[in-house]
C-alpha cells in the first residue's frame, strides 16, 4: 500500500470521574467522545495540508472512569485538585505506544482560563506529538508524549460544545505540529480592518474563541504549513488506512450492530463484546431488539423504549427528545423559536442552537466594550452591542443608548465567556482575565527536562 492511504490517526480516549459525574451515564460520556471526535474529523478531513488530504480520526479504545473509580488506586486521575500540567503528565506516564494520540477528557476548572494542554509535534529532533513512542526522560520516568487533555469547564461555567470541539481540534493541532498562530496573516481577529476582524481567528489562536465566527473552525496558513511538515515525516510511523470499524471502542460504527466494548467493560446483556469470535462480536445477541450502546431509547432489557419516554432533556433552545418506539436513537428535538433568550439572557436561539448574541434580537451586533486607552475595564464583561459595522456605537446593554432594547439592564457575560476582543475570559467576579496561553506547557517542559524544578503532588 502507498503511504498516501495512511491517513487515519487512532485515538485512545480516557475520561475521568469528574467528566462522568457531569454527564451522568456511560452512554452520555460515549456520546460526548463521539461528538468531539466527529467534530475534529470533519475539520481535519476538509483541510488540505499542502497536498496531504483526508486526514481522519478513529477511536481505537476508550476508558471511562466512573464515580466508582474515584478511590481506585490504579486510577491515576482520581486526585481532586490537580493542576493542568500535572494532569497532562499523569496521562503521559501511561504507555500509549498502540495509539497515534491519547487524550483525557475532564470537567475541571484549571487556572487562568486553560481549556486544554498538549505536547507539540515537530518534524524531527523533538519529543512530543503524533506517533511519539514511550521513552525515558531526564526526570527518570518513562513517558508517552503523544498526549493531550481537555476540560469542559472554565471559570465555573461549562463551555458550549462548539468551543469544546474547537479546543480539542486546537490541542490535536499542537500534537500535529502547529504552534499558536501569530502575525497579521494568521490572527485576523486582531486586525484593525473590520472586514478581516469580523471573520475571527483561526483554530490555533493563542487565547479565547467563541466558536461561531467563520475562521474559528479552520486552520490558518501558518498552521497548515507547520502541520504538513510533521505529517510528511511522521504519519507513516503510526497512521493507518481508514476503513474498518473498530469493535470494542464503545461506538457503533458502520458494519457493527452494537458495541459495548471489551469483556472487562461490557455491562450489556444485549450485545456480544469485542472479545467474542469474529462472527459474533459487536452483534446483537439472538432475540434482542437493540442494545443501549446504540442509543438512549433502548432499555437494559434490550427492547425499544416506548413512544412517550424522554431521551433528552429540554434545553434553552430545544424541546425535550422523545423516543419514537422503533429505534434506539433519540430523535431530533424540535427547536424553540428563533430569538428566544438563552444562556442566561446573553444569547439567543438560532435554529435550535444557542448561537447568536442577545444583540441580534434587536438588529445589533455584539462588540467588545473597551476604552481606547485601556484604563476603564469595568465593562469588559458586559454584553455590549453596536449598530451593524459601526464600532463607534458600541455600548453596554445597560447603557443609555440601548435603553429601548434592554431597559437599563446590564447583561453580564457568563463566567468563562471570551472578553476584551478574545484576549481573555470573564471570571466569576466579572473581571476579564487575560490568558497566558504558553505558560503551562513551558512549565511542564521545565519540569520534565529539569526535574529539580518539579513539585510532586500530595495525595
Amino acid at each position: 500500500t502507498t503511504s498516501a492511504e495512511k491517513n487515519t490517526c487512532q485515538l485512545y480516549i480516557q475520561t475521568d470521574h469528574l467528566f462522568f459525574k457531569y454527564y451522568g451515564t456511560r452512554e452520555a460520556v460515549i456520546a460526548q467522545i463521539s461528538s468531539h471526535v466527529k467534530a475534529i474529523d470533519t475539520i481535519y478531513q476538509t483541510t488540505d495540508f499542502s497536498g496531504i488530504r483526508n486526514i481522519s480520526f478513529m477511536v481505537k479504545r476508550i476508558r471511562i472512569n466512573t464515580t466508582a473509580d474515584e478511590k481506585d488506586p490504579t486510577n491515576p486521575f482520581r486526585f481532586p485538585n490537580i493542576g493542568v500540567e500535572k494532569f497532562l503528565e499523569l496521562n503521559s506516564e501511561q504507555n500509549h505506544d498502540d495509539y497515534c494520540l491519547a487524550y483525557v477528557f475532564t470537567d475541571r476548572d484549571f487556572d487562568d482560563g486553560v481549556l486544554g494542554l498538549a505536547w507539540v509535534g515537530a518534524p524531527s529532533g523533538s519529543s512530543g506529538g503524533i506517533c511519539e513512542k514511550s521513552k525515558l526522560y531526564s526526570d527518570g520516568k518513562k513517558k508517552s508524549l503523544n498526549t493531550g487533555i481537555i476540560t469542559v469547564q472554565n471559570y465555573g461555567s461549562h463551555v458550549p460544545p462548539k468551543v469544546s470541539h474547537i479546543t480539542f481540534a486546537h490541542e490535536v493541532g499542537h500534537n500535529f505540529g502547529s504552534p499558536h498562530d501569530s502575525g497579521t496573516e494568521c490572527t485576523p481577529g486582531e486586525s484593525k480592518n473590520l472586514g478581516q476582524k469580523e471573520n475571527g481567528n483561526y483554530i490555533m489562536y493563542a487565547r479565547a474563541t467563541s466558536g461561531d465566527k467563520l475562521n474559528n473552525n479552520k486552520f490558518s496558513l501558518c498552521s497548515i504549513r507547520n502541520i504538513s511538515q510533521v505529517l510528511e515525516k511522521k504519519r507513516n510511523n503510526c497512521f493507518v488506512e481508514s476503513g474498518q470499524p473498530i469493535c470494542g471502542n464503545g461506538m457503533v460504527e458502520q458494519g457493527e450492530e452494537c458495541d459495548c466494548g471489551y469483556s472487562d467493560q461490557c455491562k450489556d446483556e444485549c450485545c456480544f463484546d469485542a472479545n467474542q469470535p469474529e462472527g459474533r462480536k459487536c452483534k446483537l445477541k439472538p432475540g434482542k431488539q437493540c442494545s443501549p450502546s446504540q442509543g438512549p431509547c433502548c432499555t437494559a432489557q434490550c427492547a425499544f423504549k416506548s413512544k412517550s419516554e424522554k431521551c433528552r432533556d429540554d434545553s434553552d433552545c430545544a424541546r425535550e427528545g422523545i423516543c419514537n418506539g422503533f429505534t434506539a436513537l433519540c430523535p431530533a428535538s424540535d427547536p424553540k423559536p428563533n430569538f428566544t433568550d438563552c444562556n442566561r439572557h446573553t444569547q439567543v436561539c438560532i435554529n435550535g442552537q444557542c448561537a447568536g448574541s442577545i444583540c441580534e434580537k434587536y438588529g445589533l451586533e455584539e462588540c467588545t466594550c473597551a476604552s481606547s486607552d485601556g484604563k476603564d475595564d469595568k465593562e469588559l464583561c458586559h454584553v455590549c452591542c453596536m449598530k451593524k459595522m459601526d464600532p463607534s456605537t458600541c455600548a453596554s446593554t445597560g447603557s443609555v443608548q440601548w435603553s429601548r432594547h434592554f431597559s437599563g439592564r446590564t447583561i453580564t457575560l457568563q463566567p468563562g465567556s471570551p472578553c476584551n476582543d478574545f484576549r481573555g475570559y470573564c471570571d466569576v467576579f466579572m473581571r476579564c482575565r487575560l490568558v497566558d496561553a504558553d505558560g503551562p506547557l513551558a512549565r511542564l517542559k521545565k519540569a520534565i527536562f529539569s526535574p529539580e524544578l518539579y513539585e510532586n503532588i500530595a495525595e
Epitope: 465593562e379 458586559h382 458600541c394 455600548a395 453596554s396 445597560g398 447603557s399 443609555v400 443608548q401 435603553s403 437599563g408 446590564t410
Partner: nanobody, 121 residues
Framework: KVQLVESGGGLVQAGGSLRLSCAAS????????MGWFRQAPGKEREFVAF????????DYADSVKGRFTISRDSAKNTVYLQMNSLKPEDTAVYYC??????????????WGQGTQVTVSS
C-alpha cells in the same frame, strides 16, 4: 452616597394625569443622563423615557410617546415625568435612574426605590 428619591405616584382614573418627581442627592446630576423605567407585576422592567444633562437629547418608548413628557430642573437636581391620558396598562412601579456619565454609552448605575402608579378603569 448617591440617592434618588421618587414621589408623585398614586391611584388615578383612566384618562387622568400624574406628575412624578425624582430628586437626586449626593452628587450634581446636571451633567448626567436621567431616565424613567417601569415594571408591571409579573413583567420585566421596561424603558419609559430619558433626558440628557443639557436636555438636548430626549427619547421615549413608543408606548408613551405623545402622552408622557420628561423634563429636568438642574438647579433643583430633579427630573420630572408628566403623564397624561393614562391607561390601565400604565399601571406599574416607576423607577428613576441616573447614568454614570454624559454620553449615550454611559450605563444606568444609580436607581431609586420606585413609586407605585395605579390606573383604574
Amino acid at each position: 452616597k448617591v440617592q434618588l428619591v421618587e414621589s408623585g405616584g398614586g391611584l388615578v382614573q383612566a384618562g387622568g394625569s400624574l406628575r412624578l418627581s425624582c430628586a437626586a442627592s449626593g452628587r450634581t446630576f446636571s451633567r448626567y443622563y436621567m431616565g424613567w423605567f417601569r415594571q408591571a407585576p409579573g413583567k420585566e422592567r421596561e424603558f419609559v423615557a430619558f433626558i440628557s444633562g443639557t436636555g438636548g437629547s430626549i427619547d421615549y418608548a413608543d408606548s408613551v410617546k405623545g402622552r408622557f413628557t420628561i423634563s429636568r430642573d438642574s438647579a433643583k437636581n430633579t427630573v420630572y415625568l408628566q403623564m397624561n391620558s393614562l391607561k390601565p396598562e400604565d399601571t406599574a412601579v416607576y423607577y428613576c435612574a441616573a447614568a454614570s456619565g454624559n454620553s449615550g454609552r454611559s450605563t444606568w448605575d444609580y436607581w431609586g426605590q420606585g413609586t407605585q402608579v395605579t390606573v383604574s378603569s
